[in-house]
């Protein structure tokens, strides 16, 4: 029995619903009374949802899963996962049994966009060319871990003297803090780019220092 799932991971935003697609080819004369379907976590084999004896046996996964009952008879064994959380990320196996059996695993990739970075400067007054300043770029509640890039006003990457830390909160979402230590020129713009590698989403922040005063676009 051939069971088909998408090759590419299913990407779902935190808090939204995701559909884990799974299908099989019913034979002529197939009825739901013949179908047994199991969804489980691939690694731990934890039961997620099942269908047996012609009936939906229900969710065993925090009551956040559902089948598509009207589509099962056509061979659509997909699973709806509601209110996706970071902890849901991983591989799910769809096991179908009729008079033969088959299974396939589909990956769920969870993502959350990062907020627009906020920029802070230390020290933040009486600055002169030649002073060393610390610029902090902070972006919040994203997933997975971000990639952080710094550049100057001419677009030249700044890779030295950068320290980036990422801390997960209780929901598993990351807060990013990246610190750039730089010696001030006569004036200049310093930009921070926080990239979500899954969503290919970039969040920009910048600070421009022009003698006095400083501006934070």
């Amino acid at each position: 029995l051939e069971v088909q799932v998408p090759e590419d991971p299913v990407v779902a935003l935190v808090g939204t619903d995701a559909t884990l697609c799974c299908s099989f080819s019913p034979e002529p004369g197939f009825s739901l009374a013949q179908l047994n379907l199991i969804w489980q976590l691939t690694d731990t084999k934890q039961l997620v949802h099942s269908f047996a004896e012609g009936q939906d046996q229900g969710s065993a996964y925090a009551n956040r899963t559902a089948l598509f009952p009207d589509l099962l008879a056509q061979g659509n064994a997909s699973l709806r996962l509601q209110r996706v959380r970071v902890a849901d990320e991983g591989s799910f196996t769809c096991f179908v049994s009729i008079r033969d059996f088959g299974s396939a695993a589909v990956s769920l990739q969870v993502a959350a966009p990062y907020s627009k970075p906020s920029m802070t400067l230390e020290p933040n007054k009486d600055l002169r060319p030649g002073d060393t300043v610390t610029i902090t770029c902070s972006s919040y509640r994203g997933y997975p871990e971000a990639e952080v890039f710094w550049q100057d006003g001419q677009g030249v990457p700044l890779t030295g003297n950068v320290t980036t830390s990422q801390m997960a909160n209780e929901q598993g979402l990351f807060d990013v803090h990246s610190v750039l230590r730089v010696v001030l020129g006569a004036n200049g713009t310093y930009s921070c780019l926080v990239r979500n590698p899954v969503l290919q989403q970039d969040a920009h922040g910048s600070v421009t220092i022009t003698g006095q005063p400083m501006t934070f676009p």
């Epitope: 047996a52 004896e53 049994s97 009729i98 008079r99 059996f101």
Partner: antibody, heavy 118, light 110 residues
Framework: EVQLLESGGGLLQPGGSLRLSCAAS????????MHWVRQAPGKGLEWVAA????????YYADSVKGRFTISRDNSKNTLYLQMNSLRAEDTAVYYC???????????WGQGTTVTVSS | QSVLTQPPSASGTPGQRVTISCSGS????????VNWYQQLPGTAPKLLTY???LRPSGVPDRFSGSKSGTSASLAISGLQSEDEADYYC???????????FGGGTKLTVL
């Protein structure tokens, strides 16, 4: 008539190897999953291994994983069980069974006896 | 130790009704279904009921299966001497990815 006929059993020493065969007839062998189930003397039934119709999905009991290999040749309507590193506790009657709806096994062979003893 | 739990023995007199229980869990009987097998002395097992309550052709309607939650039972009414045999329940265990049998119940017709 649907029939399953096992062969290949015998007496051998611990550490030995043996290949069991199951010849199927009377049904479309290539459309059904198949199992091996065993029964030690005076004991209950123990599921050993299962293979789906085209051999793409295989499952084993933990007690035989890494030592036994289930396979099939649909052109010959035959199911196999290759048993390596045999132990005394593998002594049993081995049944070949046909998969049926709802995880059931609706046709059983007469069984072949494997005895592992030094 | 079997994943599915059955009483080791049961007995009854001819004509009586006897019930054999099978206790499982959320990941086997609770998630899927249960099948029952009869093994007469010296013979291969035979499928008695499947999908908890269906009978293959040729199985008398004296045999009936049922399931409730994570447990199942096999009832034999109008007990006959030829019913003396071992009875096994079986299921698929989704947490083990294996087929599982109960330990078997030896039915004696007194």
């Amino acid at each position: 008539e649907v029939q399953l006929l096992e062969s290949g059993g015998g007496l051998l020493q611990p550490g030995g190897s043996l290949r069991l065969s199951c010849a199927a007839s009377g049904f479309s062998f290539s459309s059904y999953g198949m199992h091996w189930v065993r029964q030690a003397p005076g004991k209950g039934l123990e599921w050993v291994a299962a293979i789906n119709s085209d051999g793409s999905r295989i499952y084993y009991a933990d007690s035989v994983k890494g030592r036994f290999t289930i396979s099939r040749d649909n052109s010959k309507n035959t199911l196999y069980l290759q048993m390596n590193s045999l132990r005394a506790e593998d002594t049993a009657v081995y049944y070949c069974t046909k998969y049926y709806y709802h995880y059931a096994m609706d046709v059983w062979g007469q069984g072949t006896t494997v005895t592992v003893s030094s | 130790q079997s994943v599915l739990t059955q009483p080791p023995s049961a007995s009854g007199t001819p004509g009586q009704r006897v019930t054999i229980s099978c206790s499982g869990s959320r990941s086997d009987i609770g998630a899927t279904t249960v099948n029952w097998y009869q093994q007469l002395p010296g013979t291969a097992p035979k499928l008695l009921t499947y999908q908890s309550h269906l009978r293959p052709s040729g199985v008398p309607d004296r045999f009936s299966g049922s399931k409730s939650g994570t447990s199942a039972s096999l009832a034999i009414s109008g007990l006959q001497s030829e019913d003396e045999a071992d009875y096994y329940c079986a299921s698929w265990d989704a947490s083990l990815n294996t087929w599982v049998f109960g330990g078997g119940t030896k039915l004696t017709v007194l």
